[in-house]
């Protein structure tokens, strides 16, 4: 913590300006009035401050506003934001998205990916739901900040905001967001044309169930292997042989190159090596001829 | 434009351990495994191992087992390889290589980084 | 594994020459997945051909790849200055995947 001292007259600051660039750390903390520092916010970003400025201005600040700081300030706070923590951020109430905009675009090329996501979910919060212009402002100033977002607060998007989700927001998503966002985008794009329908479906088929997914093999979507390899493992290990081919169509050459890698090498392992070789593709693994498959689990479930 | 930007040239002692970054970009990251490679002068090209950046689930030419760790970080579209106990059979340039899932060909190469290892 | 041996190891052509480049497997390839990589030196490795015979985007019609089973080639049918550079098979039928050991290609 800074040492307090008293300010000498001629330093008394009665604006913020360049010339505060010169004051000492301590002189700082001394002559810089925290009041007339949140009201004249918008000039600090213009300022050449050290870091170690900066350190002070923000204890200033929150002497200031213990229990948070209010929007006035936070929309002003520009590289000072760099030196929050998730902490202080988790503090804030956040509504507008001229704010959000312009700390994320502070935030840029700074390993921030903490503060921003805890900065987005006060947004949420503040805005009472996942609306479309968050969104927008959201894949325009932060691709992928999406799944920054906890499972519970991406259950408050619309479907009708789906549509504005572009394929490579949600490629850090993880199964359990994609489990809230695809019955969302189900829903969203219901009324599309078959083809059309898996184009848009295809970023969000990672939290499909199989029924969905058996759906699909009868449409003739021929899903690409990358696609098939974010499927949930759960949904493709009840998959039979015939329903992968015709889910794959000509990419099922694919399932070769990946039959080492899950979830293509545990669903090999639940199939029948017979079923397996009217592929020709030459997988292995698959359960021999003539061996029975007991599922223990339901037999103890019956018992 | 599609790129695979590698670290520049490491000098380590025997026995350390160097971890290499491969930061992609230009690409959906999660739509490409990332394999690695490493090129010697006496033994040419050789295939390291894979790791597919939706489920970190990797795949090791034996021969790498316990030399090689294949890591990814998806928010910062990077994968990592980390190579240890390391001795001058390890000198070598290391490439990392991008391959479409479903297919076995790199068709995007890194810049490669050069590993020497001497004392 | 599968060893692929490519021959010759070193060679060199005169202008609008014909070349090929050999690469034999120790066993069977699918020819669906077995490619060829262009390297200069000084930079990294490029892919040239895939699947045997599919020219990669931005070569020059004046390569081909043709081949089966355990032996695949790769054809310049006129030799250019920039064809120069070392040549590497490599196959992904089997794990490991494996690469030849090249052919450098010199200009005469």
């Known amino acids: 913590d800074v040492e307090r001292t008293t300010c000498p007259p001629e330093k008394e600051v009665h604006e913020i300006d360049e010339s505060l660039i010169f004051y000492k750390k301590r002189e700082l903390e001394a002559c810089v009035d925290a009041a007339l520092l949140a009201a004249q916010m918008d000039r600090v970003d213009a300022i050449p401050f050290t870091y170690e400025q900066l350190d002070v201005l923000k204890h200033k600040l929150d002497e200031l506003y213990p229990q948070g700081y209010p929007e006035s300030v936070i929309r002003h706070l520009g590289h000072l934001f760099l030196k929050m923590s998730p902490e202080d951020i988790r503090k804030w109430n956040v509504t507008s998205l001229e704010t959000l905009k312009a700390l994320l675009k502070v935030s840029k090329g700074h390993e921030m990916s903490a503060q921003v996501a805890t900065l987005i979910d006060r947004v949420v919060v503040g805005r009472g739901q996942l609306d479309k212009d968050t969104v927008d402002t959201l894949t325009a100033f932060c691709p992928g900040c999406l799944c920054s977002l906890s499972p519970e607060r991406l259950s408050s998007v619309p479907p009708s905001v789906i549509g504005a989700v572009r394929p490579q927001d949600l490629d850090t998503c993880g199964p359990r967001q994609l489990d809230v966002l695809y019955p969302k985008a189900r829903l969203a794009f219901q009324n599309m044309s078959g083809s059309e329908y898996f184009v848009k479906i295809r970023p969000f088929l990672g939290g499909a169930p199989t029924e969905d997914v058996k759906a699909l093999s009868q449409q003739n979507v021929s899903m690409d292997l990358a696609t098939f390899m974010k499927l949930r493992r759960e949904a493709v290990l009840p998959l039979t042989v015939a329903e992968v081919q015709k889910l794959l169509g000509p990419h099922v050459e694919g399932l070769k190159v990946e039959e080492q890698h899950s979830p293509v090498r545990d669903w090999i392992l639940k199939q029948r090596q017979d079923d397996l070789d009217t592929l020709g593709l030459g997988l292995q693994g698959g359960i021999p001829n003539g061996y029975l498959i007991l599922d223990l689990s339901v037999r103890e479930a019956l018992s | 434009e599609v790129q695979l930007q590698q670290s520049g040239p490491e000098l380590v002692k025997p026995g350390a351990s160097v971890k290499i970054p491969c930061k992609a970009s230009?690409?959906?990251?999660?739509?490409?495994?990332m394999d690695w490679v490493k090129q010697s002068h006496g033994k040419g090209l050789e295939w390291i191992g894979d790791i597919n950046p939706n489920t970190d689930d990797t795949i090791y030419n034996q021969k790498f087992n316990g030399k090689a760790t294949l890591t990814v970080d998806k928010s910062s579209s990077t994968a990592y390889m980390e190579l240890r106990s390391l001795t001058s059979e390890d000198t070598a340039v290391y490439y990392c290589s991008r391959r479409l899932i479903g297919t076995g060909y790199f068709d995007v190469w890194g810049t490669g980084t050069t590993v020497t290892v001497s004392s | 594994q599968i060893v692929l041996t490519q021959s010759p190891a070193i060679m060199s052509a005169s202008p609008g020459e014909k070349v090929t480049l050999t690469c034999s497997a120790s066993s069977s390839v699918i020819s669906t997945y077995l490619c060829w990589y262009r390297q200069k030196p000084g930079s990294s490795p490029e892919l040239w051909i895939y699947s045997t015979s599919n020219l990669a985007s931005g070569v020059p019609a004046r390569f081909s790849g043709s081949g089966s089973g355990t032996s695949y080639s790769l054809t310049i049918s006129s030799m250019e200055a920039e064809d120069a550079a070392s040549y590497f098979c490599h196959q992904w039928s089997n794990y490991p995947y494996t690469f030849g050991g090249g052919t450098k290609l010199g200009m005469k």
């Open positions: 230009g690409y959906t990251f999660t739509d490409y495994n």
